[in-house]
Amino acid sequence: QLSLPSILPNENEKVVQLNSSFSLRCFGESEVSWQYPMSEEESSDVEIRNEENNSGLFVTVLEVSSASAAHTGLYTCYYNHTQTEENELEGRHIYIYVPDPDVAFVPLGMTDYLVIVEDDDSAIIPCRTTDPETPVTLHNSEGVVPASYDSRQGFNGTFTVGPYICEATVKGKKFQTIPFNVYALKATSELDLEMEALKTVYKSGETIVVTCAVFNNEVVDLQWTYPGEVKGKGITMLEEIKVPSIKLVYTLTVPEATVKDSGDYECAARQATREVKEMKKVTISVHEKGFIEIKPTFSQLEAVNLHEVKHFVVEVRAYPPPRISWLKNNLTLIENLTEITTDVEKIQEIRYRSKLKLIRAKEEDSGHYTIVAQNEDAVKSYTFELLTQVPSSILDLVDDHHGSTGGQTVRCTAEGTPLPDIEWMICKDIKKCNNETSWTILANNVSNIITEIHSRDRSTVEGRVTFAKVEETIAVRCLAKNLLGAENRELKLVAPTLRSELTVA
């Protein structure tokens, strides 16, 4: 644990002359900050700066150029990195008094005049004098109220509901505060706060609306923090709903939003009776104009097997909401004529998911598919090519002999997607062709045998093998294969001499 920071001057309290300057130095083993009486708006004449010194300690100086009654209060120096909400502000304190003959009491905000008492608890009526020597009395409608007074805090006691006034006399001049109203309140020990933003994405010129609702609490202070706050851009409203239970609805409206209004919108509710605080936050983004982003979950070339069911999912981010359509080969997809369906589902505020579903893929489903997303500001599309993969099959296997030369050509026509490869095998011993070991693959480099392949279209291929001379009966096998399957057919090639003998016979 770090030892507490130290303050110079090393005093519990100090009286500073009106309009004079004063400075407080804080020394700590880690970075230190100051907490002081005025709010940020009132503290234009309070300067805080870091100072270098050779002691190895961190030094932060608080300087007031012209002390006024409003500077009266508790100044606390603390380690700023160790602050946790439920812990005491851990630091060193000094109380500064700035006596002002014309200002007997430290100026207060209007909410300070409302004193909330809970269940007969003691309360503090916070009239603090600018001079510790000033005598003060507390009065209500019945006269002087006996209560203990501490010039640093005010009157402490158990007070009945009603108005109270503090009275002081400075150099023969009498001062009275405006009435402090003591109010009894039933408050819950927790704050039930809900935030609602119907939209978190906007474009320039639109109106941002955020609401925060506090339930079952009568007196709540709610502060908004948002990007346009410094410019006073937001309009705040409070609606009190009493039926069926108390509900305070605070609305922040930012008209004519710009990109600079993007950021965190936070409402912080604080219960008047105690330091119970609850915060809620939403992140709003404002875009110069509408936008569309398309994120496919698949590539630009996709394959589907024949009869397969396949889904193609595209994520779309868009604002304002997009219209989404699908095209096939640049024509609108007519779903009712095909076993293809599309749908669009809203996943989040600006996220959509569109699916193209192929129910039972057919060859004719191959083609170019395009998703088009458009709104009033943007159009985006994504196109992919779909190939329906079909197992290879042999359409035709025929031979063609070359008359007297004794040469013969075998043609094998096959189809499939991807285009099948064609392989040739021969069996030279016709009696043993039932045995698989009798078949050999026909190599390309065998003399007097020529093999060639021609593709007829995207899915049909023709392979040819030409035998310069067939001297004995052989069997030829055409094997067509692709990724999805293989098929083979066989054909007998009879030597021309044998054929003529057969013809004579």
């Epitope: 160790t82 602050q83 946790t84 439920e86 020990s189 936050k281």
Partner: antibody, heavy 120, light 107 residues
């Protein structure tokens, strides 16, 4: 060094009450918020309640609201958890936890835990 | 309340390998996130706070990153003593909530 020692756990019947205590030492107890966190057998951690350094604020997880009360006695450096109308689902090891003693916001010191078993 | 979701539920890693644990918050918790390690029969121990600040005495092989809703705890080279259950916890909102835990076990 910082020490948190829980006591008061045991076996109790459903609907009955139990009071857990946590004795703190090694730091300025009156300056720090204190929490109770529990862990059912074989399960994860669940935050139960917090009390501000000065006792003025108390928060609870919804499942124990109205049944459990967290309190502290800064003069005795002791944290308490009064558990009424106990249910079987309250069976857990209860840890007393210090917050922000050396770091910001996180639970930096834990006791060894005390087992509460609610069973008929 | 903010729901914290950790993944995976169990991570099997060999000693010396890197382990990466994820924690997701149902809404932004800024950098108000802590990581704890718990071994059987022991109380949890704070490792990381402020999403990425390592507690004094915690080995440098432990590191945290992320802000908003997505967070990661990385253990660069697992030692035998690192096999345990790890929890993330947010302290941005009441009630404080923990993730369900990730068990890091020996592969």
């Amino acid at each position: 060094q910082v020490q948190l020692v829980e006591s008061g756990g045991g076996v109790v019947q459903p609907g009955r009450s139990l009071r857990l205590s946590c004795a703190a030492s090694g730091f300025t107890f009156s300056r720090y918020g204190m929490h109770w966190v529990r862990q059912a057998p074989g399960k994860g951690l669940e935050w139960v309640a917090v009390i501000w350094y000065d006792g003025r604020n108390k928060y609870y997880v919804d499942s124990v609201k109205g049944r459990f009360t967290i309190s502290r006695d800064n003069s005795k450096n002791t944290l308490y958890l009064q558990m009424n109308s106990l249910r079987a689902e309250d069976t857990a090891v209860y840890y007393c936890v210090g917050v922000g003693i050396t770091v910001t916001g996180a639970f930096d010191y834990w006791g060894q835990g005390t087992l509460v078993t609610v069973s008929s | 309340e903010i729901v914290m979701t950790q993944s995976p539920a169990t991570l099997s890693v060999s000693p010396g390998e890197r382990a990466t644990l994820s924690c997701r918050a149902s809404q932004s918790v800024r950098s108000n996130l802590a990581w704890y390690q718990q071994k059987p029969g022991q109380a949890p121990r704070l490792l990381i706070y402020g999403a990425s600040t390592r507690v004094t005495d915690i080995p440098t092989r432990f590191s945290g990153s992320g802000s908003g809703t997505e967070f990661t705890l990385s253990i660069s080279s697992l030692q035998s003593e690192d096999f345990a259950v790890y929890y993330c916890q947010q302290y941005n909102n009441w009630p404080r909530t923990f993730g369900q835990g990730t068990k890091v076990e020996i592969k």
